[in-house]
Each structure stands twice: as C-alpha cells, then as structure tokens.
C-alpha cells in the first residue's frame, strides 16, 4: 500500500459518515412460547403473552432484554419484528385448554404486536392479524403470522397480545414465537 | 485529511472490534418450487421438498449452496429463514395431484423448517405452521407462511418438510418458496 | 497506533472490497393501508393498492420513494419485501365495502407483490398468497401475509395487487401494509 500521504488516503468506504458497526453486535431476540398462567385482564383489552427467552431456540443478545412479557429496545433504529401464534380449539369438555366456561369455538382469533413507550400513556398497535373462525370440525388449529419493519426508540417495549390466551398452542417452541432484530 | 500520525487516526467506526463486512457479501438464498417427484418416506416422517436454486427468481450467493433438498449454511451467525408453501386439494378423481388413493381432503396441512447437523442424526424443528382443513368446497387452496431468526453454525443444513407432498402447489414460483439470509 | 508505514496498515476489516455502508443509510419503506378509490381495471388483471407513506407508522427513507401505487427502488441489491392484506366480507346488503353488485362472498382471495421494470413491458410476480374462501358465517375476515428476499435493480418498481379491492380492510394501519428494505 505504501505510506499514506496527503490526500492519498481514500478507502472505498469513505462515503460513510454514520458510525459503522459489526452486524453480530446488533440487538436481536427470538422468544418462544411457554405455558401461560391465566391472568386477570379488562374485558376489551387483549392479554399479553409471556415467553421463554433462553432455553431451546430462544435467545436475546446485544442488550436486547426480555422482562415481564416485554422485549426492551436498547437502541433506536429500524427493527424487523415478527410473531407467529398458533391457536387451537377443541369442543371436548375435558380439553386442557378449555377454561371457566369460556367457549372454545370463538368467533375470531387475533394477534397484536404492541409498542409501549413510557412517556406516552397509550400503547401503539404495530401489527394485527385477525381471522374469523368458521371451522366445522370439533378440533381446529391454525397459525397467524405477522412481520414488518418499524422505527423504534431506545426504551420502547414490545409485547404480543392475543384475543384469548386459553386458545394459544404452547406445546412446541416452533409453533408460537416472537422476535425482533435491528436492521 | 493530511498524513496520519500518532493517535490522530480515529475514523468514526473505531468502536467496532469485530471485523466489518460488506452486506452484499453475505450468504443468501431464495429457492422456488419445482414439481416434486414422489419419494418413499416413513409413515410418521414428513417428506422434504426439493427446490429450484438458479432459474427464474431463485438464487444462491456468497457460498450459500443448495444440494439435494438442503440449503447448506457456509458461515456461523444469525439467519432469517422463511418459507411459504401453498397447498391445494381437489376432490375430482382426475386431479393431477391426486395420488395412489390418498384422500385429497386431509385433516390438516403442515410445513416444518428443519435444521440438520451432520454430527447428530436427529433433526431440530425450527419453525412449524400447521392448520386444520375444514374447507367445504370441492377445490381448496391456501398458503402457510413461516419466518424467523435463528443462530446457525457453519455446516448446518436446512430443509422444508410438508405433511403431504402431493398437496403442494408447484405451478408457480411465487406461490411456494424457501429462503434464508445472514443478518 | 503510531504512524502508518509500508504494509503495516491492516485493519481487521481489510477483507472487505465492496464499499461498506452504515445500515441506517439503506433504502427502507413501510407503507400502510388507506381507503381505496375504486378504479377501472381489466377483467383478468388484479388492481393495485395505493398506500400511506408518511403518516402514522408509515415511512420511506434513504431515497426509497413512493409514488402512484409504486415503491421505487433507488439502488440495486437484495431486498426483503413483505406485505399483509386483511380481507373482509359481509353478506349484508348495506355493507360499505359491498360494491356494484359484486358478490361479497368470493371463491378466493389473492395478494400479489409485483415488480415492474420500465425497460420490460411485462410485470414480474414476485410473491403470491392465494386462498379459497369457504367461510360459512355471514361476516368473515382474514389476513394473507407474504415476505421474501429478491434481487432488485435501481429503477425497479414494486406494487401490491389484490383480487378484489372492495374486500380489503382499510380501517387500520396495522392490518394491511407493505414494506421493503435493502439487506
């Protein structure tokens, strides 16, 4: 290369003024389903799921932390956020996921990925997948998948809400999951 | 810029200690559906799809290779992996995809993205999309989409398995596909 | 570091020959649904949706522009492209989304993400999600999600086409959306 003199130092990436950063160093998380403990929630408010964050296929890295149903965004930027929730219903009375007289054949199933910002009282719905249920068989199951890119701020919190927590299939980590990564 | 002397060399990306790399240089693949040749498989084992890797919209690049139904991971890191499989069923006896007396109206349809590690015979299921089928019409069709991020090791292999290969819509490259890219 | 002499200049990223670039500087867009104005379209040609590109969750950045139903690709490279369209149908005659005697209970619903290249007259279908509709209830709704990676050229244009514009749920920005980002 020879000695670098005067204006001769012109590496191919000189056009970049924002700090570069190694990709492996970006905040990332993939969370997987766990058995849900039924919690009290308001009638028109969808309950939030809680997640596994370190066993099996689940992980959080590079300051992306999971705590109390929330993914915490450690750095401002554009994130790709995704989730799949597999729902299942059984008309059999003895079904483990049938609870407290709640019908196991709902009119609809819904997943919402929600952003909470501490400085703003009202959560923001980022993504919604909603489907009417017209299964005619006694046992039914189906996934709802969501994914998109959003500009998030350091300190934002993400959660996944569902229309009926008792219908979520928690039996396998590959069926119901939630993740985000900085682009 | 002038000559670089002493401690004056401090580009804006000095905080990065891991090697930086150009994004266009990362392993990537998008594979598209081809007509499947029916293969023998065990009763409780879902068959793997094979794929187009270089014609039309399909490609592999930067050491990501496709061989014998598998995507080969050339470099350890976090990958986003996705697939869509469109299923279709027809009750008409003359249907091209009706095979060997197998009913074309299944109870369910399932897609699994599976990781295989050479040092271990048992595959790991990364993603599963499974849906009960209760279509009442004679002809039905629907997609299952999956996508998420996983930490993979150099040498890992990825495949897509389905519950019934005869129900996969192989007619168009935009309907059924499989891809992965290093983040 | 000392003065840089001779061959001593060997930073850890010297293996990168393509220009490096800051991630925050890449073309990106997330577009959200707006109420569609019914337009004339040919019988066998699916109409394109138009989108919100700057209000609410919608944004375009780094030379990715939206104009007249199209996302304009400002730079060649590999892009992840995604869309969700939520469809809904109501059998009630007074339904706002029931139009011009068109039946509101279609046989199928379809979303296509299409690439248009000015130098080539025929659009390329990149992604298709298509589903037969066999809902038995009077009101039905469901999303179709698509996402994959494609190699695009500067000047390419992307749009989202649907089988029936009158069935698209435009009521909420989190239900129906379209986005792309350079990897």
């Amino acid at each position: 290369m020879g000695a670098l003199k005067g204006q001769e130092f012109a590496p191919s990436h000189q056009q970049v003024y924002a700090p570069l950063r190694a990709d492996g160093d970006k905040p990332r998380a993939h969370l997987t389903v766990v058995r849900q403990t039924p919690t009290q929630h308001f009638k028109n408010q969808f309950p939030a799921l809680h997640w596994e964050h370190e066993l099996g296929l689940a992980f959080t890295k590079n300051r992306m932390n999971y705590t109390n149903k929330f993914l915490l965004i450690p750095e401002s930027g554009d994130y790709f956020i995704y989730s799949q929730v597999t729902f299942r219903g059984m008309t059999s009375e003895s079904s483990e996921i049938r609870q407290a007289g709640r019908p196991n054949k709902p009119d609809s199933i819904t997943v919402v990925i929600t952003k909470v910002t501490d400085s703003y009282p009202e959560p923001t719905q980022l993504l919604m997948g909603t489907k009417s249920v017209s299964e005619v068989g006694s046992n039914w199951f189906q996934p709802i998948y969501l994914g998109a890119m959003f500009s998030l701020q350091e300190g934002d919190k993400l959660m996944v809400n569902v229309s009926d927590i008792s219908l979520v299939d928690y039996t396998k980590e590959d069926k119901t999951f939630f993740g985000a990564f900085l682009l | 810029m002038g000559a670089l002397k002493g401690q004056e060399f401090a580009p804006s990306h000095q905080q990065v200690y891991a090697p930086l790399r150009a994004d266009g240089d990362k392993p990537r693949a998008h594979l598209t559906v081809v007509r499947q040749t029916p293969t023998q498989h065990f009763k409780n084992q879902f068959p793997a799809l094979h794929w187009e890797h270089e014609l039309g919209l399909a490609f592999t690049k930067n050491r990501m290779n496709y061989t014998n139904k598998f995507l080969l991971i050339p470099e350890s890191g976090d990958y986003f992996i996705y697939s869509q499989v469109t299923f279709r069923g027809m009750t008409s006896e003359s249907s091209e995809i009706r095979q060997a007396g197998r009913p074309n109206k299944p109870d369910s349809i399932t897609v699994v993205i599976t990781k295989v590690t050479d040092s271990y015979p048992e595959p790991t299921q990364l993603l599963m999309g499974t849906k009960s089928v209760s279509e009442v019409g004679s002809n039905w069709f629907q997609p299952i989409y999956l996508g998420a991020m996983f930490s993979l090791q150099e040498g890992d292999k990825l495949m897509v398995n389905v519950s019934d290969i005869s129900l996969v819509d192989y007619t168009k490259e935009d309907k059924t596909f499989f891809g992965a890219f290093l983040l | 570091m000392g003065a840089l002499k001779g061959q001593e200049f060997a930073p850890s990223h010297q293996q990168v020959y393509a220009p490096l670039r800051a991630d925050g500087d890449k073309p990106r867009a997330h577009l959200t649904v707006v109420r569609q104005t019914p337009t004339q379209h040919f019988k066998n040609q699916f109409p394109a949706l138009h989108w919100e590109h700057e209000l609410g969750l919608a944004f375009t950045k780094n030379r990715m522009n939206y104009t007249n139903k199209f996302l304009l690709i400002p730079e060649s490279g590999d892009y992840f492209i995604y869309s969700q369209v939520t469809f809904r149908g109501m059998t009630s005659e007074s339904s706002e989304i029931r139009q011009a005697g068109r039946p509101n209970k279609p046989d199928s619903i379809t979303v296509v993400i299409t690439k248009v290249t000015d130098s080539y007259p025929e659009p390329t279908q990149l992604l298709m999600g298509t589903k037969s509709v066999s809902e038995v209830g009077s009101n039905w709704f469901q999303p179709i999600y698509l996402g994959a990676m494609f190699s695009l050229q500067e000047g390419d244009k992307l749009m989202v086409n649907v089988s029936d514009i009158s069935l698209v749920d435009y009521t909420k920005e989190d239900k129906t959306f379209f986005g792309a980002f350079l990897l």
Partner: antibody, heavy 124, light 107 residues
C-alpha cells in the same frame, strides 16, 4: 451414542486455577444447554453454572459468581469451566450435564445426560 | 434463591414395598421440578422432569406428582436396583437448586 466426557481435574493449591473441559458427542450440541454440577465428598449435588450453547447466555450459583466462568466452543462441541481463586471447599467431583428442554413451552425438562465426572482436589 | 427441603433424610424399606419421597420448595416452582437417582460411584440419572413426566427409559414404577411447593416421588414397588440416593431439583428460577437428598436403603 450421546456422550459427555469431562477432563481437566486434578490437584491444585489454594488460590490456584484450573480449567475443566467437557466434550460432547452424538447430539446437536448447539440446541441443548449444559450445566456443571459438583458433589463434594460424602455430600449432595450442587448446581454450579449453566450455559446456552445456542446463544452463550450464562447463569451461576451465587456463591461462585466471579470466580468461575463457563464458556463453550461450538466448533469443537466443547464446554469449559474456568475456576480461579480455588479454595479447599471447591474440592469435589465435577460433572457436566446436558439440559434437555424438550422443545416445548409446557416443560422445563431436566439434566438427561451426565458425564462420568472429573475430580478436583484443592489442597496445599 | 429457592430452597428445596427433602424428607425423610433416610427411608429404610424392603424390596417390593412402596416408597414415597417428599420435596418441599420455599416458594412456588410451578411444575418445574425434576427428580434424579444416584448410586454410589455413579453420575446421577434423570428420572422425572416437570414434576410428573418420566424420562426416557425410566420404568413405570417411578412416578412424580405435585405442583407449586409440594412434590412427591413414588416408587410403587421397590426393586433391588432402586436403593440409592434421590435428589429433587427446581428449574423455575435461577439459580437452579437441588434438595439435600433422600437415601433409600434396604431395611
């Protein structure tokens, strides 16, 4: 055959250091977490540390945090326990054990595969 | 940290008898409790995971029950090879912790 084989034990003086290794074979190393568990002579089992071979997350027994470091090398299917500032009370048989999560949100699993153990003696 | 207390410390029984071992947690561990068997000079062996699920290859005479803070391992009819030390382990909260063990010896 699924196997864990520990090595690296031995006699070390108080204040000294030792690095234990655990070589795994016969399974997908990156999927299952691994714990180190120790057993002092004539005593019960004591959990020492855990690592996710998948993502590198770690947890330690409170009394040992700061002196012991668990790590892994996925390319070598190997796990390590670096033990510093050793004390007489660290004398034990050290086992590595695979943590089976069973891939289900319904379960937390258990340690389903154990090595034969390696003996660490801290004495002057 | 969660403390697990096993009782009794020693259980003296004859082959063919029923053994009932108890494990009590200082706070709820849901169903996230495992049981292990250890024989002299050997590594422990997983018997039961998640309170009631038998591990691969474990005979049906071993069963587990309980949730929250109180758990039981039952050996319906003791075989000669079952005389050993049994440990419970909670897997609900870090750090994982073991009980002090129950020794099942031949009467």
């Amino acid at each position: 055959e699924v196997q864990l084989v520990e090595s690296g034990g031995g006699l070390v003086q108080p204040g000294g250091s030792l690095r234990l290794s655990c070589a795994a074979s016969g399974y997908d190393f990156t999927y299952y977490g691994i714990s180190w568990v120790r057993q002092a002579p004539g005593k019960g089992l004591e959990w020492v540390a855990w690592i996710s071979t998948y993502n590198g997350n770690t947890h330690y027994a409170r009394m040992l945090q700061g002196r012991f470091t668990i790590s892994r090398d996925n390319a070598k299917n190997s796990l390590y326990l670096q033990m510093n500032s050793l004390r007489a009370e660290d004398t034990a048989v050290y086992y590595c054990a695979r943590e089976n999560y069973y891939g289900s949100g319904a379960y937390r699993g258990g340690m389903d595969v154990w090595g034969q153990g390696t003996t660490v003696t801290v004495s002057s | 940290e969660i403390v697990l207390t096993q009782s009794p410390a020693t259980l003296s029984l004859s082959p063919g008898e029923r053994a009932t071992l108890s494990c009590r947690a200082s706070q709820s561990v849901s169903s996230y409790l495992a049981w292990y068997q250890q024989k002299p000079g050997q590594a422990p062996r997983l018997l039961i995971y998640d309170a009631s699920n038998r591990a691969t290859g474990i005979p049906a005479r071993f069963s587990g029950s309980g949730s929250g803070t109180d758990f039981t391992l039952t050996i319906s009819s003791l075989e000669p090879e079952d005389f050993a030390v049994y440990y419970c382990q909670q897997r609900s909260n870090w750090p994982w912790t073991f009980g002090q063990g129950t020794k099942v010896e031949i009467k």
